[in-house]
């Protein structure tokens, strides 16, 4: 009996036309939502004038439906048993699941000012930038609507910066009508233990953002894993959002709509400094902000963001070192709300429920030559927003799963 089930599972999890896996893989049957909480700065003047702690108040959730578009350019390669695809991006605002509208205003760090002052360190260029910042009436902080902050706005300061520069700024700009990839993943036809594992991303096996093993593209995209998942496994996956591969470890057994699943979580060790977790040495890319690689819980992804000083962390600086959150008031990290988990059905390896949580931060540094940054006495890793991307198998799909998969085994 068990052998027959194994054979059936192996057949059905292959990523090719006609299998259960393929149908759900091309276009997810799960509704996926991305909730945003924006960190509204309460004391912009005090920070700019006196280098005070930044007082933030989170506002949210503002919810978007995401991942509703089918994969594009799906191409099987029979020679190397892979399937390649693009994952199109799309976001639809869900007013009924949100605390306000996309027109709500927030006081946030001026993204362009922080980025330009970081990218251009030369003092004479900084004098020019200062002139343009003042001329455009820009400051260290700005008021922007949710729509502008997420999806893009024309920045008045950047509009004065001479060619060639993108004058549109947004944390997720450009998003709609773009696609992530090309991904090329193993379809599992020849070896089921490799199904969904990424072979190449954008035509390469490495990212070119990190040194050594940190640069590798490991595992799947976390939507599914090879079947027959064991609790002892370390599940590797790649996330283009954070420009790196990461891993999850087993935490607990969970019952999801009558389906037994394994809850895998991203452990604090994954965010540790190289002092505590030597494997992370290659995620430490500079010595000053990281205090000689002793800081932890923030990931400098500037190399992946055209030099813009973007730092990724867990929400509210969960699992981050005290020095990171010390200049920010109003944060309350807790594991339950702010960690990332994947609920995986172990027989098929399908992720039936997940919560992916991350925070986008921007580094801002003092600058002698830029008036609006002149009074700063320290570096700040400024939280801009955090997001919670969630998906849960629907009731109908869960019934089907119970009857066709778990029911048969039990």
């Amino acid at each position: 009996g068990d052998l027959l089930i194994q054979k059936t599972i192996k057949k059905q999890v292959v990523l090719e036309e006609g299998t259960i896996a393929f149908k759900n893989w091309v276009k997810t049957g799960t509704e996926v939502y991305r909730q945003f909480w924006i960190f509204d700065v309460q004391n912009p003047q005090e920070v700019m004038m006196n280098s005070s702690n930044i007082q933030v108040k989170q506002r949210g959730p503002y919810t978007y439906r995401v991942r509703f578009l089918a994969k594009e350019n799906v191409t099987q390669d029979a020679e190397d048993n892979t399937v390649s695809f693009l994952q199109p991006n799309g976001a639809i605002f869900e007013p009924s699941l949100s605390v306000g509208t996309e027109a709500d205003n927030f006081t946030v760090l001026n993204l362009a000012v922080a980025a330009a002052s970081h990218i251009y360190q030369n003092q004479f260029v900084q004098m020019i930038l200062n002139s343009l910042i003042n001329k455009s009436k820009s400051s260290m902080f700005q008021v922007r609507t949710l729509r502008e902050l997420l999806w893009g706005y024309r920045d008045p300061f950047l509009s004065l910066v001479p060619y060639p520069v993108t004058t549109t700024v947004g944390l997720f700009y450009p998003y709609n009508n773009t696609a992530d990839g090309v991904y090329k993943v193993f379809n599992g036809k020849d070896n089921i233990s490799k199904v969904a594992i990424i072979d190449t991303y954008k035509g390469k096996r490495n990212l070119s953002y990190w040194e050594s093993h940190c640069d590798m593209i490991n595992g799947t995209d976390a939507a599914s894993f090879p079947p027959f998942v064991e609790k002892s496994q370390v599940l590797q996956f790649f996330s283009s959002d954070i420009c790196r591969s990461i891993y999850a470890v087993f935490e607990s057994d969970v019952n999801l709509k009558g389906i037994p699943v394994y809850r895998f979580v991203l452990p604090s060790k994954a965010f540790a400094s190289p002092v505590e977790n030597p494997d992370n040495y290659c995620f430490c890319t500079e010595k000053i902000i990281s205090k000689n690689c002793t800081s932890y819980g923030v990931l400098d992804i500037s190399k992946c963001k055209e030099g813009r000083p973007v730092y990724i962390s867990l929400p509210h600086f969960l699992y981050a070192s005290p020095d990171v959150s010390e200049p920010i008031d109003g944060l309350n990290p807790n594991e339950e709300e702010h960690r990332t988990y994947l609920d995986i059905e172990p027989i098929t390896g399908f992720t039936l429920q997940f919560a992916k949580r991350l925070q986008v931060n921007l580094l801002v540094k003092p600058s002698e030559k830029i008036q609006v940054l002149k009074n700063l006495k320290r570096n700040y890793i400024v939280p801009i927003l955090w997001l919670n991307e969630t998906g849960t198998i629907g009731d109908e799909k869960a019934n089907m799963f119970r009857s066709q998969v778990t029911g048969k085994i039990n």
Epitope: Q121, V125, I128, L132, L160, P162, Y163, P164
Partner: nanobody, 118 residues
Framework: QVQLQESGGGLVQPGGSLRLSCAAS????????MSWYRQAPGKERELVAL????????DYADSVKGRFTISRDDAEKTVSLQMNSLKPEDTAVYYC???????????WGQGTQVTVSS
Amino acid sequence: QVQLQESGGGLVQPGGSLRLSCAASGLAFSTYAMSWYRQAPGKERELVALITSAGGTTDYADSVKGRFTISRDDAEKTVSLQMNSLKPEDTAVYYCSAWRATLFKPYWGQGTQVTVSS
């Protein structure tokens, strides 16, 4: 090979005028912000005037506002600084500079001496 060549410096009495000119070659001139900096003996180099590329937005150091005027001629690849009501404290070496977002530091000219003295 990018070259910026300043001219028009000299000795002038307080209250007098001078027009500095900077001729550029080897660069797509119209895509650059052009600036004039100056450096007085024993002092830091400071930004005096700036003109952006498209639209030609201008900006000036507070100390020269209302007295100096920067202009550009993209066809001739020149940038000029008209200096009126000159004061002794305007005495310095004046440098022409070109910068755009692809550069981490500006291009510089050799400088031209301006002396305001009676």
